[in-house]
């Protein structure tokens, strides 16, 4: 019980994180004028990763994309990258966690390959997580160590190539929502991972105990097999907990491991 | 075509009050942010107050800040200015203007008439 | 605040001829984020509201002749008429739209000759 809410637990706070990655990836407010001399300002500047955007007292607002790959500076591509890597192996470990929930019944499908799905997916988030934190921390570095003094749009600005009148840029909310986001989504990846331990059996469990009552043909399976009438009409019949893919013929075939009454 | 008119100007007492008011139609009055200017006789135009669109933000001179407070009621088009500890100095003509891009006042009313005197 | 600057005070033009009026700022009104520069022209007739000519420096408002056209950058700013007619006499205004307190120049008195 406790490691289906631990993975169900994981797997919800992951979902949560990486919806709030692909938020903060696609806000414009990474970086926003900083208003420390000017709070009464009619022209607000900020900035995203795919746009800058310009808002102004009268309401309205302008957005200029940055229509140029090969202009825009390494790090704001670099940024890109890890934001949109964090997200495609997030989308990737969502998948594989729904097959791998342990309340959701698909097929035959053995606990130790569950078990398996549940750690690859916390992988996936543990390292979609660490992806969107270094993202928004290297843009973050980027603010404090550029400070971003005269610049004329993203791209320009960094690069050094316009000087214009000072606009200092600060912290957006994209920022925050980013950490929070990589936070939670690295937190459900650890949980997932927890969630695996508890999903894969001991290597020391009992293997199964046949019991052959005379006149009926009814096999008793301690530790978590299913109970059929009769051997020949139930042969691959897949145990539930078990480290390793027998079926109950291949286990039939060690006599020596079963007491016979 | 976009109308603005003003009323509630008139001759007032130094340190007296005055409310106006501008109706404004055949426009989304409730997208525009709204100022209003004035203009002494003879004299250049000033700023007095604006407020956003969404009435959340109001903005003023040194001049006339803490006296004078700028309203709007979205629901019945109407922009108001409540003008209180009045001074001979602020006798003008009161425009409203809404803004447009580039925080352009694109569109103007007559004018209404402040007579600051005792 | 910043301070706006016009000149001449009054300029008179023979009708047909160029009319250029000059605006210059005390702070660089041009915004980094957009590059876009924040002074808006006026006109104002006698008895009459200040009417929009042009924002942004050089955006001609709709409906405002052509041979009305703005330049400039930064702090110097010009509004030239091209081809000055009977009905462009009044006063011109140049204004601070980057930031508050939004502040006018003292406006240029154009006239015919």
């Known amino acids: 019980m406790a490691v289906t809410a631990c993975q169900g637990l994981g797997f919800v706070v992951s979902l949560i994180g990486i919806a709030g990655i692909i938020a903060a990836t696609c806000m414009d407010q990474w970086s926003t004028q900083d208003l420390y001399n000017n709070p009464v300002t009619a022209v607000f500047n900020y900035q995203g990763l795919w746009r800058s955007c310009v808002r102004e007292s009268s309401g309205f607002t302008e957005c200029r994309g940055y229509f140029t790959l090969l202009g825009l500076p390494a790090m704001l591509q670099a940024v890109r990258a890890l934001m949109i890597v964090g997200i495609v192996l997030g989308a990737i470990g969502l998948l594989v966690s729904i097959f791998a929930l342990k309340c959701i019944r698909i097929g035959s499908m053995e606990d130790s390959a569950k078990a398996n799905m549940t750690l690859t997916s916390g992988i996936m988030f543990i390292v979609s997580g660490l992806c969107a934190i270094a993202g928004v921390s290297v843009f973050a570095n980027m603010l404090v160590t550029n400070f971003w003094m005269s610049t004329a749009n993203m791209y320009t600005g960094m690069g050094g190539m316009v000087q214009t009148v000072q606009t200092r840029y600060t912290f957006g909310a994209a920022l925050f929502v980013g950490w929070v986001a990589g936070g939670l989504t690295l937190i459900g990846g650890v949980m997932m991972c927890i969630a695996c331990r508890g999903l894969a059996p001991e290597e020391t469990n009992y293997k199964a105990v046949s019991y052959h009552a005379s006149g009926h043909s009814v096999a008793y399976k301690p530790g978590g097999f299913k109970a059929s009438t009769g051997f020949g009409s139930n042969t691959k019949n897949k145990k539930i907990y078990d480290g390793g893919a027998r079926t109950e013929d291949e286990v039939q075939s060690y006599p020596s491991k079963h007491d016979y009454v | 075509e976009v109308q603005l008119l003003e009323s509630g100007g008139g001759l007032v007492q130094p340190g007296g009050s005055l409310r106006l008011s501008c109706a404004a139609s055949?426009?989304?009055?409730?997208?525009?942010?709204m100022s209003w200017v004035r203009q002494a006789p003879g004299k250049r135009l000033e700023w007095v107050a604006t407020?956003?669109?969404?009435?959340?933000?109001?903005y003023y001179p040194d001049s006339v800040k803490g006296r004078f407070t700028i309203s709007r009621d979205n629901s019945k088009n109407t922009l108001y200015l409540q003008m209180n500890s009045l001074r001979a100095e602020d006798t003008a003509v009161y425009y409203c203007?809404?803004?447009?891009?580039?925080?352009?006042?694109?569109?103007w009313g007559q004018g209404t008439l402040v007579t600051v005197s005792s | 605040d910043i301070v706006m600057t016009q000149s001449p005070d009054s300029l008179a033009v023979s009708l047909g001829e160029r009319a250029t009026i000059n605006c210059k700022s005390s702070?660089?009104?041009?915004?980094?984020?957009?590059?876009?520069?924040?002074l808006t022209w006026y006109q104002q007739k006698p008895g009459q509201p200040p009417k929009l000519l042009i924002y942004?420096?050089?955006t001609r408002e709709s409906g405002v002749p052509d041979r009305f056209s703005g330049s400039g950058s930064g702090t110097d700013f010009t509004l030239t008429i091209s081809s000055l007619q009977a009905e462009d006499v009044a006063v011109y205004y140049c204004?601070?739209?980057?930031?508050?307190?939004?502040?006018f120049g003292g406006g240029t008195k154009l006239e015919i000759k």
């Open positions: 702070q660089s009104l041009l915004n980094s984020g957009n590059q876009k520069n924040y």
């Open positions: 055949e426009f989304t009055f409730s997208n525009y942010a």
């Open positions: 407020i956003s669109s969404g009435r959340s933000s109001t």
């Open positions: 203007a809404g803004l447009g891009r580039g925080n352009a006042m694109e569109y």
């Open positions: 942004w420096a050089s």
């Open positions: 204004q601070n739209a980057y930031s508050y307190p939004f502040t």
